[in-house]
């Protein structure tokens, strides 16, 4: 048993039929010694008396909010949560496996630049009775500080007959140098509590591997005289690391017809302009990627040809 | 990234072209190692990230762009210098700071070159003949070192008398390639920055 936060405890249980469970001793936080009684989840049934209560925790029926009272007055509470381990594996019932980039991916994280700021998100089909808390550090043996905000519900989506809820959190490395070469990964730990169930999820990554620039900005077309060609120009996104001559981007320019089946013309360039042929009803899109370290491409920025 | 990209103008800052070739070569070599050594721990998640130049060179700090010298987090590790303008020792106006940066890059290349050559000698003794270092990568290291045009004492190639442990050698190769790729990225960024200055 360990303390998750004040008056909230997690009991780790091997989860199999007729498992012996864990013996837990609860102590009433009071100077009183006599006349103390214990109840579970505000039911009227008295579980025991005395300053301590010893319980055998085997299943969810044994978890919940234990309260000690004296003469009708509440003295203290202890909330017991269960963390299930089945066949040696901790349960992952609360979050949805996003399966990207590989199976058992529950947390996904992205950074728009090398400033040490990143966003992580996760999915669940659970709508209420759900709390998350997020901690992060650089390295685990001698951890360096990363500060995370509160997890918030960032999107709701309907998937077939079911609703899916996306939660996200923003974190910032306390002392990050954008030019640094990372040798220790960032560790992100999410504690998830659904009713009486506790689970934890972790992700480990280097900022350089989760970089996804914002799309190029100010995408413009300039027709070239007496030609079907146009000059496409754009700028680095505002959120990208500076100086741009050090943190350089490379770009992919795509001409796409109205029909998805039409052949796409693609050009790759390190410059912030390109000359392409603009077909009728087509659109021109540009996306960006770190020039030297191939992490994710940005989303497309697009303009119509007409 | 095997994609059509416009090649730089040959009249540009001389080292930029070499550094781009270096990054391409080490990335290709790392990809080849990952594929060939698929049953070895060779991915970024599996290996220990070691830097053989740690406490010997200070490339990141010595080559820090001027704009980042205001960031205290970039200055906290060592007495730091930063690069100003110049070109790859092609101009007499090369500043002292820049010379420090480029000599640090040169020392990195020399240390990796020695390590890779020693390792290749061991890999050539492997009866499985599973993997060898790409001669192109070694040649590109050499070319960039020549372009940097520093004279420094030659580091003797390490020779070992004991029987090589090929498993350990292959894991060390992965560690070395990952670290060298990260350093090659830094070198490329530095050269791009200098070229724009």
């Amino acid at each position: 048993i360990w303390e998750l936060k004040k008056d909230v405890y997690v009991v780790e249980l091997d989860w199999y039929p007729d498992a012996p469970g864990e013996m837990v001793v609860l102590t009433c936080d009071t100077p009183e010694e006599d006349g103390i009684t214990w109840t579970l989840d505000q039911s009227s049934e008295v579980l025991g008396s005395g300053k301590t209560l010893t319980i055998q925790v085997k299943e969810f029926g044994d978890a919940g909010q234990y309260t000690c009272h004296k003469g009708g007055e509440v003295l203290s509470h202890s909330l017991l949560l269960l963390h299930k381990k089945e066949d040696g594996i901790w349960s992952t019932d609360i979050l949805k496996d996003q399966k990207e980039p590989k199976n058992k991916t529950f947390l996904r994280c992205e950074a728009k630049n090398y400033s040490g700021r990143f966003t992580c998100w996760w999915l669940t089909t659970i709508s209420t009775d759900l709390t998350f808390s997020v901690k992060s550090s650089r390295g685990s043996s001698d951890p360096q500080g990363v500060t995370c905000g509160a997890a918030t519900l960032s999107a709701e989506r309907v998937r077939g007959d079911n609703k899916e809820y996306e939660y996200s959190v923003e974190c910032q490395e306390d002392s990050a140098c954008p030019a640094a070469e990372e040798s220790l990964p960032i560790e992100v730990m999410v504690d998830a509590v659904h009713k009486l169930k506790y689970e934890n999820y972790t992700s480990s990554f280097f900022i350089r591997d989760i970089i996804k620039p914002d799309p190029p900005k100010n995408l413009q077309l300039k027709p070239l005289k007496n030609s079907r060609q146009v000059e496409v120009s754009w700028e680095y996104p505002d959120t990208w690391s500076t100086p741009h001559s050090y943190f350089s981007l490379t770009f992919c320019v795509q001409v796409q017809g109205k029909s998805k089946r039409e052949k796409k013309d693609r050009v790759f360039t390190d410059k912030t302009s390109a000359t392409v042929i603009c077909r009728k009803n087509a659109s021109i899109s540009v996306r960006a990627q770190d020039r030297y370290y191939s992490s994710s491409w940005s989303e497309w920025a697009s303009v119509p040809c007409s | 990234r095997n994609l059509p990209v416009a090649t730089p103008d040959p009249g540009m800052f001389p080292c930029l072209h070499h550094s781009q070739n270096l990054l391409r070569a080490v990335s290709n070599m790392l990809q080849k190692a990952r594929q060939t050594l698929e049953f070895y721990p060779c991915t970024s998640e599996e290996i220990d990230h070691e830097d053989i130049t740690k406490d010997k060179t200070s490339t990141v700090e010595a080559c820090l762009p001027l704009e980042l010298t205001k960031n205290e987090s970039c200055l906290n590790s060592r007495e730091t210098s930063f690069i100003t303008n110049g070109s790859c020792l092609a101009s007499r106006k090369t500043s002292f700071m820049m010379a420090l940066c480029l000599s640090s890059i040169y020392e990195d290349l020399k240390m990796y070159q020695v390590e890779f050559k020693t390792m290749n000698a061991k890999l050539l003794m492997d009866p499985k003949r599973q993997i060898f270092l790409d001669q192109n990568m070694l040649a590109v290291i050499d070319e960039l070192m020549q372009a940097l045009n520093f004279n420094s004492e030659t580091v003797p190639q390490k020779s070992s008398l004991e029987e090589p442990d090929f498993y350990k050698t292959k894991i060390k190769l992965c560690i070395l390639l990952h670290a060298f790729r990260i350093r090659a990225v830094t070198i490329d960024r530095v050269m791009s920055y200098l070229n724009a200055s």
Epitope: D41, Q42, S43, S44, E59, F60, G61, A63, G64, Q65, D93, T125, I126, S127, T128, D129, D161, N162, K163, K195, L196, K197 | -
Partner: antibody, heavy 117, light 107 residues
Framework: EVQLVQSGAEVKKPGASVKVSCKAS????????IEWVRQAPGQGLEWMGG????????NYNEKFKGRVTMTTDTSTSTAYMELRSLRSDDTAVYYC??????????WGQGTTVTVSS | EIVMTQSPATLSVSPGERATLSCKAS??????VAWYQQKPGQAPRLLIY???NRYTGIPARFSGSGSGTEFTLTISSLQSEDFAVYYC?????????FGGGTKVEIK
Amino acid sequence: EVQLVQSGAEVKKPGASVKVSCKASGYTFTDYWIEWVRQAPGQGLEWMGGFSHGSGSTNYNEKFKGRVTMTTDTSTSTAYMELRSLRSDDTAVYYCARRRFRGMDYWGQGTTVTVSS
Amino acid sequence: EIVMTQSPATLSVSPGERATLSCKASQSVSNDVAWYQQKPGQAPRLLIYYASNRYTGIPARFSGSGSGTEFTLTISSLQSEDFAVYYCQQDYSSPWSFGGGTKVEIK
């Protein structure tokens, strides 16, 4: 002892509104959700929504969104469910129940609402 | 929306016999399932929560099992007071949903 006591039966005309109350006692009111469940004559149970004063959250069944409002008054430990634009198929017994970790463990006695012109 | 399907709709059992009631969820609800008993003119009464935990004061002859999408309520030896309608309900994801009910009647 935990108790949920509901207001008395109501007869309403179509288009009218009804407000059912549920007075809780014997536990810390703000620690639990109050859920509302209805049962049409001879039919099964249908969940309408819930309100948690502790977290200030409401959780409505989409079917009733826009027609139902659930509130609480902590000073009297009373929960309310108002259903507007009543139709004849809203004729049912309306139950309140408390819920936290263990399902809906205590229920009110039910309030019969009849909608008839 | 998660649909809870109960079977059979009616179960005719003699007193003293075992009754097995089934409940299937249209998607996984982990073990967030409760079972209720309802007698005519009364409010439902909680029997089982978290799929297999007997609520305070519920006799040991009632037991629940299952997880994911398939759940079972078993009454090991039916007593006369057990003849009633039984509902399963998921509170894993909103909207909470009840099964259509299984009426256990005297054979």
